[in-house]
Structure formats: structure tokens, C-alpha cells
């Protein structure tokens, strides 16, 4: 037992209970007394004193520790004062005495972490544990400590955090609500196909923790890193009192990387089938997996069964673009979609990459829009386009880009949300290329940009400056 945890207890006779159905008391003696010198006597109010069987442990350079474990569970009663005293049988001395309540001397045994794995978002960690005394778990609170597992730096920063049992699992809230609409109409929300906000370094991690019974979710970790973690518990101080127990044995876990690093992009064209694509790695094979989860609060079974995402032929449309792996699967509109990509390198090492979860209506990719134009006067163009999806006209935003012949840089314009056309002033007697693309970014639907339309070539008439 880690009795050093009771160091703050000023009582010479220290007592603790692991489960509130047991009691262990001990004290230390510097004097070298014969075995059998001491008796530990105890009594509840108006009851005859009884002796608790003692064992002794010799402690080098100090003396002897005398320990008694109450032999009978019936002798351990909550909410009654227990009078204890140590009697010297050879000398007329009561060495020490105290009155305690068993319900106030808890020192819980450490929980055993039975599973630690990546959560549903990059940088999340899901842990589950078993409580050695499940019958008291409702009266305990838990603390987790963890840090990056860096072989080069064993004294890496450590985070200690109290687990808030009343919070619900944040990973199961609706992922990525479209609050980005408060910005410009085509501002990027954080989506599975885009860079999210950069994680803070572990020394500054303000990681969120939630727990449900014997499980908890940590977020804000570095995707792709290894972590060690430990758990301990303490009576809640309301129903039962006591001290923090010892830390559990450390477990280590390798978090999946963030699939953003692979350029993962998932989309649906029909709100039924989802296609995912990512950059093919050199000298490596890769495979996509998915699962659907319901948005309910803290489910007991947080460990998903990943299904194979059906592989498509690899595409390499041009030398300038990276080779992509693609896969597809049938989805549902009532579930959150989770994507995992496993990359196997030539030596056979498997690296996992997790995408940010999304609903199918957040991954609707529009068809490429058609761009029509006419020149009203020299260099003055009137543009018009059809909405690729009339059912979401008010949630569709566009980007128009153009460049002068022989130029490499593009100028990008963002027409107002829902616009069906606009005007453009260009330099007279010049040649231009124009392209248009569309995406959904409204309260109901969101998704990635469509492909750019085929370049529309424009040669402006003479005179009129822009």
C-alpha cells in the first residue's frame, strides 16, 4: 500500500479503507520492542473492546511498522465513531489512540485502465477503466494525468486534470456547426478536408475531459503522438471522505495522425454515396475505413467497428497533381460519419490517420457550374450562371477567378451568397481566362468546392478602360 499518501495525516495511528467495507490501521515505532508488545484495541460506542490482529514490518534505519487489517467485514461500520487505541502489553502504556469514522478515511485502490485508444476526432483519446470496488464508484471522483511519451525526453510535460463526470461526451455533439456563416459567405468552416486550428503544444494543453462511469474522453492532444496516462480516484467528499489513492500503472497509447496531413477529402453528390480521397504516399499502400455513429450522449460502447471503404481505381490526371487513392461507401443521413485511413509502409508499419467526423449534409459537393458571358461594352462583361442545385440556391456561394493571357496569377472574386450573375470590368483589347466554382455553405448544407469550370476564354473589344 502506498501509505506515503497519508503523509498529511498528523495522527500517529493512521487508518484507511480501500472499499469502505475494509479497514487497515498502522503506526510506526522507533523503539525496538519484542514481537507481541502491542495490541490494537477497538470499540464502537457501548460495545466491548476487541483486539485487531497485528503484523509487523521492520523498516531499516527507522524502526517497526505495525499493521492491522480488520479481520471481519462486519466490524467495519460506516457513520459510527470507532475508538482505537494501542496498548503496550509489557509496559503500562497506551501508545496512541484516536476516534474515527470509517466513511472519512477512504484511500481507494487505483482503477485499472483497460482500454486506451484514439477518440472520434483527431487529437482525441478515449479511455475506459475498471473500478476495483464498483459498488463505490458513484462516490468517487477521478483524476487523470498524462503526457507525451518521448523516448528522448522522459520528463516531458505532464497534464493533471480532474475528470468531470457530469459533462457529456463532446465528440458526440453535432460536429462543426456552420458558425462560419458569420464571416464572409465562402469562409471555410473547419471540415474534414481542411486544416483545422493548430493544436497547442502539450505543455500548454488545456485539454477537455469528460467521463461517463468508467470511461472518459480527452481532447486537444497532438494527433500522431504517443502518450502515457494514469488514473487515480478519491472519495467525493460528499457521501464519503478520504484521500487520493495511488496512481494506476501507466498505459501508453499511440494516437492516429490527422488525416488532413494526407489531404483527405470526403463528399457526396447524391446524399447517399460518399466518396473519400487522399494523397497516395510513396512506397506505401493505403486503405480507407468508415463507421456511422448516432448522436447520443455518452454511450456505453464507444469502441466502433470500422468497415472497409470500397476502393476505386487510383487516378493520376496529370504530372502536376498528386496521385489520389479513392474509396466509396453508402451512407445515411441520420448518423455521423467517421473516416480512418491506414497507410502501410514498405517495411509493414501501419500508420493510422483519422478524419474529423461529419454528417452527410456537411459534405455535399456540387456539380461544376456553367459560366455564360456577354460583353456589354468594351471590357464590360455581364456574367450569368445556373445554380447547380436549385434546391439549395440560397446556400450556394461562388468563386470566380480570372487571369490575363500569359499570366500565372489569378484574381479571385466572391459574388454575394445566392447571386445568379454579376458584372466584370476588364482591360479592353485583352485576352482572359475565366473560371467559376460553387459550394454549399448554409445552415442546412455544406460541402467542399466543386471543380473549377472549364476555362472560358474572353477577348475584350477595343477602347473602354476598366
Amino acid at each position: 500500500q502506498d501509505v506515503s499518501l497519508l503523509a498529511s495525516d498528523s495522527e500517529p495511528l493512521k487508518c484507511f479503507s480501500r472499499t469502505f467495507e475494509d479497514l487497515t490501521c498502522f503506526w510506526d515505532e522507533e523503539e525496538a520492542a519484542p514481537s507481541g508488545t502491542y495490541q490494537l484495541l477497538y470499540a464502537y460506542p457501548r460495545e466491548k473492546p476487541r483486539a485487531c490482529p497485528l503484523s509487523s514490518q521492520s523498516m531499516p534505519h527507522f524502526g517497526t511498522r505495525y499493521v492491522c487489517q480488520f479481520p471481519d467485514q462486519e466490524e467495519v461500520r460506516l457513520f459510527f465513531p470507532l475508538h482505537l487505541w494501542v496498548k503496550n502489553v509489557f509496559l503500562n502504556q497506551t501508545r496512541t489512540q484516536r476516534v474515527l469514522f470509517v466513511d472519512s478515511v477512504g484511500l481507494p485502490a487505483p482503477p485499472s485502465i483497460i482500454k486506451a485508444m484514439g477518440g472520434s476526432q483527431p487529437g482525441e483519446l478515449q479511455i475506459s477503466w475498471e473500478e476495483p470496488a464498483p459498488e463505490i464508484s458513484d462516490f468517487l471522483r477521478y483524476e487523470l494525468r498524462y503526457g507525451p511519451r518521448d523516448p528522448k525526453n522522459s520528463t516531458g510535460p505532464t497534464v493533471i486534470q480532474l475528470i468531470a463526470t457530469e459533462t457529456c461526451c463532446p465528440a458526440l455533439q453535432r460536429p462543426h456547426s456552420a458558425s462560419a456563416l458569420d464571416q464572409s459567405p465562402c469562409a471555410q468552416p473547419t471540415m474534414p478536408w481542411q486544416d483545422g486550428p493548430k493544436q497547442t503544444s502539450p505543455s500548454r494543453e488545456a485539454s477537455a475531459l469528460t467521463a461517463e462511469g468508467g470511461s472518459c474522453l480527452i481532447s486537444g492532444l497532438q494527433p500522431g503522438n504517443s502518450y502515457w496516462l494514469q488514473l487515480r480516484s478519491e472519495p467525493d467528499g460528499i457521501s464519503l471522505g478520504g484521500s487520493w489513492g495511488s496512481w494506476s500503472l501507466p498505459v501508453t497509447v499511440d494516437l492516429p495522425g490527422d488525416a488532413v496531413a494526407l489531404g483527405l477529402q470526403c463528399f457526396t453528390l447524391d446524399l447517399k454515396n460518399v466518396t473519400c480521397q487522399w494523397q497516395q504516399q510513396d512506397h506505401a499502400s493505403s486503405q480507407g475505413f468508415f463507421y456511422h455513429s448516432r448522436a447520443r450522449c455518452c454511450p456505453r460502447d464507444r469502441y466502433p467497428i470500422w468497415e472497409n471503404c470500397e476502393e476505386e481505381e487510383k487516378t493520376n490526371p496529370g504530372l502536376q497533381t498528386p496521385q489520389f487513392s479513392r474509396c466509396h461507401f453508402k451512407s445515411r443521413n441520420d448518423s455521423i460519419i467517421h473516416i480512418l485511413v491506414e497507410v502501410t509502409t514498405a517495411p509493414g508499419t501501419v500508420h493510422s490517420y483519422l478524419g474529423s467526423p461529419f454528417w452527410i449534409h456537411q459534405a455535399v459537393r456540387l456539380p461544376t457550374p456553367n459560366l455564360h458571358w456577354r460583353e456589354i461594352s468594351s471590357g464590360h462583361l455581364e456574367l450569368e450562371w445556373q445554380h447547380p442545385s436549385s434546391w439549395a440556391a440560397q446556400e450556394t456561394c461562388y468563386q470566380l477567378r480570372y487571369t490575363g493571357e500569359g499570366h500565372q496569377d489569378w484574381k479571385v472574386l466572391e459574388p454575394p451568397l445566392g447571386a445568379r450573375g454579376g458584372t466584370l470590368e476588364l482591360r479592353p483589347r485583352s485576352r482572359y481566362r475565366l473560371q467559376l466554382r460553387a459550394r454549399l455553405n448554409g445552415p442546412t448544407y455544406q460541402g467542399p468546392w466543386s471543380s473549377w469550370s472549364d476555362p472560358t476564354r474572353v477577348e475584350t473589344a477595343t477602347e473602354t478602360a476598366w
Epitope: E31, A32, A33, P34, S35, G36, T37, S58, T64, V89, F90, L91, N92
Partner: antibody, heavy 118, light 107 residues
Framework: DVQLQESGPGLVKPSQSLSLTCTVT?????????WNWIRQFPGNKLEWMGY???????DYNPSLKSRSSITRDTSMNQFFLQLNSVTTEDTATYYC???????????WGQGTSVTVSS | DIQMTQSSSSFSVSLGDRVTITCKAS??????LAWYQQKPGNAPRLLIS???SLETGIPSRFSGSGSGEDYTLTITSLQTEDVATYYC?????????FGGGTKLEIK
């Protein structure tokens, strides 16, 4: 100052009982400490026989337990050893002694010599 | 029972000598060891308890050491009045037992 004094018959016949008295002066045997009997055989070997504590509880050497008894008379501040069914092997000098604060025998009587012979 | 063995039953010594008497227990007695001095016709006299603690009134030339099973009584400079028999005794567990004694004799 604490003093202990043994007394008893110098000669006992085999199979009889040996009774010895230790009279303590200068300290009450009911207040504190543990009061012991030790014997020393003719070859000088010492043997602890047993004790009685301030509270009256006793413990004995298992080799003698079946035939020895230690009692006390608190009014006379005396404690006693009775050894039954003696043999010539019980010939020895018998000492009473106090177990002190440090659990060693800090005060001894001068000893009384007992011979078992027919 | 715990057996206490004093390997030398007697020593021939000279006055002023440094004398070392050893005592071995048959098991660990956790420094629950006392040393006694006995002169002919007298009761034993307590010198040291808890292996190293000198009793009040005992000259400082006497000292004790040891732990576990092995213990030593040392007299740094032997005086005439130190000629006696020395006994060790364990009080770790009953029955408390004594060593056979070591007798110091002047050469």
C-alpha cells in the same frame, strides 16, 4: 530504588513441586513493567522461564509450559513461580528480573539456588 | 525457538586489549538484542539493549553493533573489572533465549 529478592527451598525432592517467591521493593508490580523468572544451570546456561505483566497476563517458555505457573499477590507486591514434577534437570540458580522500558532485563534479584535431589 | 550462538566460550585477553565478542541468531531478530555481564556469584547485569543502546551507568568503552542475525559486543580497552562472562539475549520473540556465554580470562 527497585530491588528484587528471590526466596524458596534450597532442596526439593524429584517429582515434587518447586515454589519460589520474588519480593519487589521500591516499585508496585501492578503499576507497570513485566516481571520474569530466569534460571541458570550449573554449566552457566541461562533459560527464560516466563513472565507476569503489570496487568496480570502471563507467558511461558513452551518447554516448561505444561508444568509451570506464574502468579502474584498484589497486596504483598510479590510474584511467584511454581514448577511441578521436578527432576534433577531442574537443579539451577533461579532469578527474578524486571523487563524494563527498553524490553531488556534491567533489574535482577541475587538469585536463589535450588537443588533437586532425593 | 531462536538459537543464540556465541562462537567462543572463553577468551584469554590482556588488560588494555580491544575485545570483540560475537553473537549469532538463528534468524533475523531485528536488533532486539541485549548484552549482559555476569561476575562469579552475582546476577547478570544489563549493559546494552536494542543491539547498540548503552544503559545508564555503563562505561563508554562498551559498545554494541550489528543487525539481522549477527551482533557484536566491543570493549575498546579491557580493564580489570571487565573480567567476567558475557551473554547475549534475543527478545524478538518468546521464548526469549540467551547465548551460551563468553568468558574473559586474563593471560
Amino acid at each position: 530504588d527497585v530491588q528484587l529478592q528471590e526466596s524458596g527451598p534450597g532442596l526439593v525432592k524429584p517429582s515434587q513441586s518447586l515454589s519460589l517467591t520474588c519480593t519487589v521493593t521500591g516499585y508496585s508490580i501492578t503499576i507497570d513493567y513485566t516481571w520474569n523468572w530466569i534460571r541458570q544451570f550449573p554449566g552457566n546456561k541461562l533459560e527464560w522461564m516466563g513472565y507476569i505483566t503489570y496487568s496480570g497476563s502471563t507467558d511461558y517458555n513452551p518447554s516448561l509450559k505444561s508444568r509451570s505457573s506464574i502468579t502474584r499477590d498484589t497486596s504483598m507486591n510479590q510474584f511467584f513461580l511454581q514448577l511441578n514434577s521436578v527432576t534433577t534437570e531442574d537443579t539451577a540458580t533461579y532469578y527474578c528480573a524486571r523487563l524494563g522500558r527498553r524490553y531488556a532485563l534491567d533489574y535482577w534479584g541475587q538469585g536463589t539456588s535450588v537443588t533437586v535431589s532425593s | 525457538d531462536i538459537q543464540m550462538t556465541q562462537s567462543s566460550s572463553s577468551f584469554s585477553v590482556s588488560l588494555g586489549d580491544r575485545v570483540t565478542i560475537t553473537c549469532k541468531a538463528s534468524e533475523d531478530i531485528y536488533i532486539r538484542l541485549a548484552w549482559y555481564q555476569q561476575k562469579p556469584g552475582n546476577a547478570p547485569r544489563l549493559l546494552i539493549s536494542a543491539a547498540t543502546s548503552l544503559e545508564t551507568g555503563i562505561p563508554s568503552r562498551f559498545s554494541g553493533s550489528g543487525s539481522g542475525e549477527d551482533y557484536t559486543l566491543t570493549i575498546t580497552s579491557l580493564q580489570t573489572e571487565d573480567v567476567a562472562t558475557y551473554y547475549c539475549q534475543q527478545y524478538w520473540t518468546t521464548p526469549w533465549t540467551f547465548g551460551g556465554g563468553t568468558k574473559l580470562e586474563i593471560k
